[in-house]
């Protein structure tokens, strides 16, 4: 039980960290290439991981202006790191009925980041709802 609890906590920490990185990037939205990117919204149940991978695959880019380029590039790179997998995530990977990334509405970086954050928050909420024990201790 303890190792599975630790795994769940690692997953939760990773999702929370991604939100912090998204919030950091939102401060630099004017230094991002104003390109429209697929931004899933109102993601149907069991397609969260598919939508998550769409956000990770999107070509968010620094406009290479000013002295924020390094922090932006590092933040983008960190957003693309694979999170610890969960049973739910493994199950969802087998779903073939989720929309393709291209089918999602494309949005500029500001809205793209807001929608990414909303999805991460939804995934944290689902993760918490599926947990039976009431502690976040590691």
């Amino acid at each position: 039980h303890k190792s599975s609890s630790q795994g769940q906590d690692r997953h939760m920490i990773r999702m929370r960290q991604l939100i912090d990185i998204v919030d950091q990037l939102k401060n630099y939205v004017n230094d991002l290439v104003p390109e429209f990117l697929p931004a899933p919204e109102d993601v149907e149940t069991n397609c969260e991981w598919s939508a998550f991978s769409c956000f990770q695959k999107a070509q968010l880019k620094s406009a290479n202006t000013g002295n924020n380029e390094r922090i932006i590039n590092v933040s983008i790179k960190k957003l693309k790191r694979k999170p610890p997998s969960t049973n739910a995530g493994r199950r969802q990977k087998h779903r073939l009925t989720c929309p393709s990334c291209d089918s999602y509405e494309k949005k500029p970086p500001k809205e793209f980041l807001e929608r990414f954050k909303s999805l991460l928050q939804k995934m944290i909420h689902q993760h918490l709802s599926s947990r039976t024990h009431g502690s976040e201790d590691s």
């Epitope: 690692r10 939760m12 920490i13 960290q17 590691s138």
Partner: antibody, heavy 117, light 106 residues
């Protein structure tokens, strides 16, 4: 058990810098990010920023940007918070706190920094 | 920035009393709210995370509720060790703490 042990009290002159350390034990250091929070005498808590202990990535409270630098040394499982251009308003107790799944789950004992001419 | 406002800033109560502390966010923070307890000269301790979930080892007399912008910390029957200052903290967007509520002995 998880422990965060901070460096001792410091007295600094206005305009100087201070570097506070926080040594972690009882868990895998690079698995958890670390926050820094401060508390002026008789006042509330103020979040300063956080550091990813695995790669030194930082996110700072805009209020402290340009004055605060957070670093880490994985060989000693220690994080550092340096605050420059000190002024009297920076007199406070500075805490490190571990980035738990959804909260700051373990805290250091605090380090009092007094800024006085 | 999200501002967090706690009320009251202080209150006097007796052992056995039911105590309620409120916290209001300047914008919707969903359930992204934590509560900490701090005693004089000590570091804060986590009590409740994600609005209503009790941190391990925290007595069940502590409970949290709310959503959106309005949140409550309740101590169902105040014990001598509960006299302390309580802080709410949002983690919807980075981190911000409330100003604190000091619970004193009546």
């Amino acid at each position: 058990q998880v422990q965060l042990v901070q460096s001792g009290a410091e007295v600094k002159k206005p305009g100087a810098s201070v570097k506070v350390s926080c040594k972690a034990s009882g868990y895998t250091f690079t698995d958890y990010w670390m926050h820094w929070v401060r508390q002026a005498p008789g006042q509330g808590l103020e979040w300063m920023g956080l550091i990813d202990t695995s790669d030194s990535y930082t996110i700072y409270n805009q209020k402290f940007k340009g004055r605060v630098t957070m670093t880490r040394d994985t060989s000693t499982s220690t994080v550092y918070m340096e605050l420059s251009s000190l002024r009297s308003e920076d007199t406070a107790v500075y805490y490190c706190a571990r980035y738990g799944p959804l909260a700051m789950d373990y805290w250091g004992q605090g380090t009092l920094v007094t800024v006085s001419s | 920035d999200i501002q967090m406002t706690q009320s009251p800033s202080s209150l006097s109560a007796s052992v056995g009393d039911r105590v309620t502390i409120t916290c209001r966010a300047s914008q919707d923070i969903s359930n992204y709210l934590n509560w900490y307890q701090q005693k004089p000269g000590k570091a804060p301790k986590l009590l409740i995370y994600y609005t209503s979930r009790l941190h391990s080892g925290v007595p069940s007399r502590f409970s949290g509720s709310g959503s959106g912008t309005d949140f409550t910390l309740t101590i169902s029957s105040l014990q001598p060790e509960d006299f302390a200052t309580y802080y709410c903290q949002q983690f919807h967007t980075l981190r911000t703490f409330g100003g604190g509520t000091k619970v004193e002995i009546k």
